[in-house]
């Protein structure tokens, strides 16, 4: 699987999950998030050669087409597969609130 | 929606579904498919600027991060959203068989 366990341990050029730290205030301008100050959102990147973690029949077909037609511009793209939530602390005035934000952290990637 | 209705009618540079005709024999080397000879598989391509048909909170966050950090290499990618099946005819010996291949045709795209 193209997940953090594999990708963070290997120098993988092809489609894999990459570490990306985002600071809420500096990178997004979100002043309302109190804790954490930032988090590892991660992202997916790298080429999708034929049959690499293909998501659907279409991506397999497209990968094969691309292999047999190297001049073609159509090829699958490396995108998130599994995402996890992030728990944050914010304030409503002076009152602290805890919220779970869905689909915030990329754990693995696929070729789609 | 970034679907065939919109994308095929507009000269859209950003993420959109593009027409792609695949000939089973010539492009894939699939001699076993009798009918059709080929089909419009289509594909997704084009930049994913901030907020364009974002798939998840993560892709929105990544788009925002990319906008505020233009030097960043992390950005969402244009990939299939809705896929449709394709019905094919093939032969097992002299016996014709009809099969529906799932997820063969891209109908719309998203930034993921």
């Amino acid at each position: 699987a193209l997940d953090t366990n594999y990708c963070f341990r290997n120098l993988e050029e092809n489609c894999c999950v990459r570490p990306l730290y985002i600071d809420f205030r500096q990178d997004l301008g979100w002043k309302w998030v109190h804790e954490p100050k930032g988090y590892y959102a991660n992202f997916c990147s790298g080429p999708c050669p034929y049959l690499r973690s293909a998501d659907t029949t279409h991506s397999t077909v497209l990968g094969l087409y691309n292999t047999l037609n190297p001049e073609a511009s159509a090829s699958p793209c490396c995108v998130p597969q599994d995402l996890e939530p992030l728990t944050i602390l914010y304030y409503v005035g002076r009152t602290p609130k805890v919220e779970q934000l869905s689909n915030m952290v990329v754990k693995s990637c696929k070729c789609s | 929606a970034l679907d065939t209705n919109y994308c095929f009618r507009n000269l859209e540079e950003n993420c959109c579904v593009r027409p792609l005709y695949i000939d089973f024999r010539q492009d894939l080397g699939w001699k076993w498919v009798h009918e059709p000879k080929g089909y419009y598989a289509n594909f997704c391509s084009g930049p994913c600027p901030y907020l364009r048909s974002a798939d998840t909170t993560h892709s929105t966050v990544l788009g925002l991060y990319n906008t505020l950090n233009p030097e960043a290499s992390a950005s969402p990618c244009c990939v299939p959203q809705d896929l449709e099946p394709l019905t094919i005819l093939y032969y097992v010996g002299r016996t014709p068989k009809v099969e529906q291949l799932s997820n063969m045709v891209v109908k719309s795209c998203k930034c993921s």
Epitope: G29, K31, W32, G93 | T57
Partner: antibody, heavy 120, light 108 residues
């Protein structure tokens, strides 16, 4: 230049609903919290609630809970305020405003206001 | 909810004079959860002061805010003709956000 442009005036019957829009331009919409404030004719200001775009966390004044819904559409940088079960006392100018960044905060940019008249 | 009481209800002064507007909260707001706005007829409110004493961008330095706890003051050191309007204080320490009833500053 930051601008919040609201939809036009509305005349509504008692018991019906109204949905007012507020389109942002000139700044990063999803980095800000948007609040809604209303002002009855000749009266003071009354906060209704606010929303954090992207994550769609909304916070409402207790007296409007169940009657007001504030949403954000990031793709168009637009916030909506829908008020249901309208009564004559809801006749007011409705303003959207961006806060300085917190959920409850001072409001630095305001829309031009939308007059909602509730009359039978 | 926190009730804000502004005084006086109406203040009649002449250009060049000093204006002192008061805002009292029904419970302590600490030192940084109060804002002041100016509103002219037919216009949206305009933020003057936030955090009790910080001037918003573009606001002339004749406007100043002070106070903490339950008592806050907006001072206009030297009134200009364009300063005559209604002034509101706002608290954002607790939900719901509340506003004072306003002080009308009129030309004497």
């Amino acid at each position: 230049q930051v601008q919040l442009v609201q939809s036009g005036a509305e005349v509504k019957k008692p018991g019906s609903s109204v949905k007012v829009s507020c389109k942002a331009s000139g700044y990063t919409f999803v980095s800000n919290v948007i609040s809604w404030v209303r002002q009855a004719p000749g009266q003071g200001l009354e906060w209704m609630g606010g929303v954090i775009p992207i994550v769609d966390i909304a916070n409402y004044a207790q007296r409007f809970k169940g009657r007001v819904t504030i949403t954000a559409d990031e793709s168009t940088s637009t916030t909506y305020m829908e008020l249901s079960s309208l009564r004559s006392e809801d006749t007011a100018v409705y303003y959207c405003a961006s806060t300085l960044g917190l959920v409850l905060d001072a409001m630095d940019y305001w829309g031009q206001g939308t007059l909602v008249t509730v009359s039978s | 909810e926190t009730v804000l009481t502004q005084s006086p209800g109406t203040l009649s002064l002449s250009p060049g004079e000093r204006a002192t507007l008061s805002c009292r909260a029904s419970q302590s707001l600490g030192s940084s959860y109060l804002a002041w706005y100016q509103q002219k007829p037919g216009q949206a409110p305009r933020l003057l002061i936030y955090g009790a004493s910080s001037r918003a961008p573009g606001i002339p330095d004749r406007f100043s805010g002070s106070g903490s706890g339950t008592d806050f003051t907006l001072t206009i050191s030297r009134l200009e003709p364009e300063d005559f309007a209604v002034y509101y204080c706002q608290q954002y320490a607790d939900s719901p956000i509340t506003f004072g009833q306003g002080t009308r500053l009129e030309i004497k």
